[in-house]
């Protein structure tokens, strides 16, 4: 029961986290104009990963997409890549975890397969969360660097002839959404990995029973049959060894005798 709850909660937390990562990636307010001491501005600038926007005091908002790829800063491209990788991994993780949920029965899928899938999705969520946190942190670092650079420029004018208002940018709402969402996805992934341990079937100790046939003394141990069907005591050890390395297809297929060499 606790395992099911942990797995279910991990799934829900990851789902919320990934939704947050998607929202953050799509949001325009990654960086917003620093308003200094003035909360009311006639022209308010803010920027996202995909476009920059200007909101005027008239209420009119104009957004322009970044229609160039090569002209964009490498850091912005890196942040985009990290966020997209995070979303893709998270989406695949969600898909895998749906089938891995203990409360959902799909055909005659065994607990070992579900445990494998739970671990896979858990690792995917962890990596997804880390990608989002890394992406947001890289962008935040870029903002801090640019903020202090533009602050320095504000006080070193062009000979003092003409004052130029330097637009400084600070953290936008998307950064906080991204950090929280990445954290949630990470926590959800950890919960899935914890649930995986509980899902893996416990080793069953069978006592060897001796049957005395006339003229022969043969001992039959049930382990032999189990090894070929994947339910034997070896399964647990196998899980720890290569569970995380399996592909989605391998996890969903039934183990054959070739799986256990």
């Amino acid at each position: 029961m606790a395992v099911t709850a942990c797995q279910g909660l991990g799934f829900v937390v990851s789902l919320i986290g990934i939704a947050g990562i998607i929202a953050a990636t799509c949001m325009d307010q990654w960086s917003t104009q620093d308003l200094y001491n003035n909360p009311v501005t006639a022209v308010f600038n803010y920027q996202g990963l995909w476009r920059s926007c200007v909101r005027e005091s008239s209420g009119f908002t104009e957004c322009r997409g970044y229609f160039t790829l090569l002209g964009l800063p490498a850091m912005l491209q890196a942040v985009r890549a990290l966020m997209i990788v995070g979303i893709v991994l998270g989406a695949i993780g969600l898909l895998v975890s749906i089938f891995a949920l203990k409360c959902i029965r799909i055909g005659s899928m065994e607990d070992s397969a579900k445990a494998n899938m739970t671990l896979t999705s858990g690792i995917m969520f962890i990596v997804s969360g880390l990608c989002a946190i890394a992406g947001v942190s890289v962008f935040a670092n870029m903002l801090v660097t640019n903020f202090w650079m533009s602050t320095a420029n504000m006080y070193t004018g062009m000979g003092g002839m003409v004052q130029t208002v330097q637009t400084r940018y600070t953290f936008g709402a998307a950064l906080f959404v991204g950090w929280v969402a990445g954290g949630l996805t990470l926590i959800g992934g950890v919960m899935m990995c914890i649930a995986c341990r509980g899902l893996a079937p416990e080793e069953t100790n069978y006592k060897a029973v001796s049957y005395h046939a006339s003229g022969h003394s043969v001992a039959y141990k049930p382990g032999g049959f189990k090894a070929s069907t994947g339910f034997g005591s070896n399964t647990k050890n196998k899980k720890i060894y290569d569970g995380g390395a399996r592909t989605e297809d391998e996890v969903q297929s039934y183990p054959s005798k070739h799986d256990y060499v």
């Epitope: 501005t41 006639a42 022209v43 200007v54 008239s58 009119f60 003409v162 130029t164």
Partner: antibody, heavy 115, light 113 residues
Framework: EVQLVESGGGLVQPGGSLRLSCAVS?????MNWVRQAPGKGLEWVAW????????TYADDFKGRFTISRDDSKNTLYLQMNSLRAEDTAVYYC???????????WGQGTLVTVSS | DIQMTQSPSSLSASVGDRVTITCKSS????????????LTWYQQKPGKAPKLLIY???TLESGVPSRFSGSGSGTDYTLTISSLQPEDFATYYC?????????FGQGTKVEIK
């Protein structure tokens, strides 16, 4: 079509108060008060976000003038206190439009501060 | 606050003349976010409310004749009337629309020669 009609102007003694009104019909996100002293140029007084009520003022009017709006009546106000002779002017309400220009203006209301 | 300086303060011209009014701001009105200059031009006739002519330094307000044009960037701006018409004799104002407080130039009065 946006229509702006000012009212409330008149003669007031120095140190006195007056409240100007601007009846607004049509869509307005934000509004301004602009004044023009006789024979002089235009002077911006204040701005307000008609949705949030967030105001901002020119330095000369901070503390003396208050811009506000009444959602239910769709009316813009300018409360003027501690009036001085130099506040004598025609007061216009104007809608902020694209590029922060002011595209619709009222007919103006004359405020005369004199003893 | 941004100061706006218009020149000339008045000018005399004839119908059909090309008229140029300049406006200088103490700070750049160019917004880096959209690369637009937040300068506005108005026309005012005696006893009337001002009329918006141009916003974003060069964008003509709907209904304004095409003989009016605006140009400039940063701190220097120009309003040009390509062929002056009788109804164009009025006072013209430039306005900083980039930052609060909004400020107006002192005005340029265009009179009949």
């Amino acid at each position: 079509e946006v229509q702006l009609v000012e009212s409330g102007g008149g003669l007031v003694q120095p140190g006195g108060s007056l409240r100007l009104s601007c009846a607004v019909s049509g869509y307005t996100f934000s509004m301004n008060w602009v004044r023009q002293a006789p024979g002089k140029g235009l002077e911006w007084v204040a701005w307000i976000n008609m949705y949030t009520g967030e105001p901002t003022y020119a330095d000369d009017f901070k503390g003396r003038f208050t811009i506000s709006r009444d959602d239910s009546k769709n009316t813009l106000y300018l409360q003027m206190n501690s009036l001085r002779a130099e506040d004598t002017a025609v007061y216009y309400c104007a809608r902020t439009s694209r590029g922060n220009g002011m595209d619709y203006w009222g007919q103006g209301t004359l405020v005369t501060v004199s003893s | 606050d941004i100061q706006m300086t218009q020149s000339p303060s008045s000018l005399s011209a004839s119908v059909g003349d090309r008229v140029t009014i300049t406006c200088k701001s103490s700070q750049s009105l160019l917004n880096s976010g959209n690369q637009k200059s937040y300068l506005t031009w108005y026309q005012q006739k005696p006893g009337k409310a001002p009329k918006l002519l141009i916003y974003w330094a060069s964008t003509l307000e709907s209904g304004v004749p095409s003989r009016f044009s605006g140009s400039g960037s940063g701190t220097d701006y120009t309003l040009t009337i390509s062929s002056l018409q009788p109804e164009d004799f009025a006072t013209y104002y430039c306005q900083n629309a980039y930052s609060f407080p909004f400020t107006f130039g002192q005005g340029t009065k265009v009179e009949i020669k």
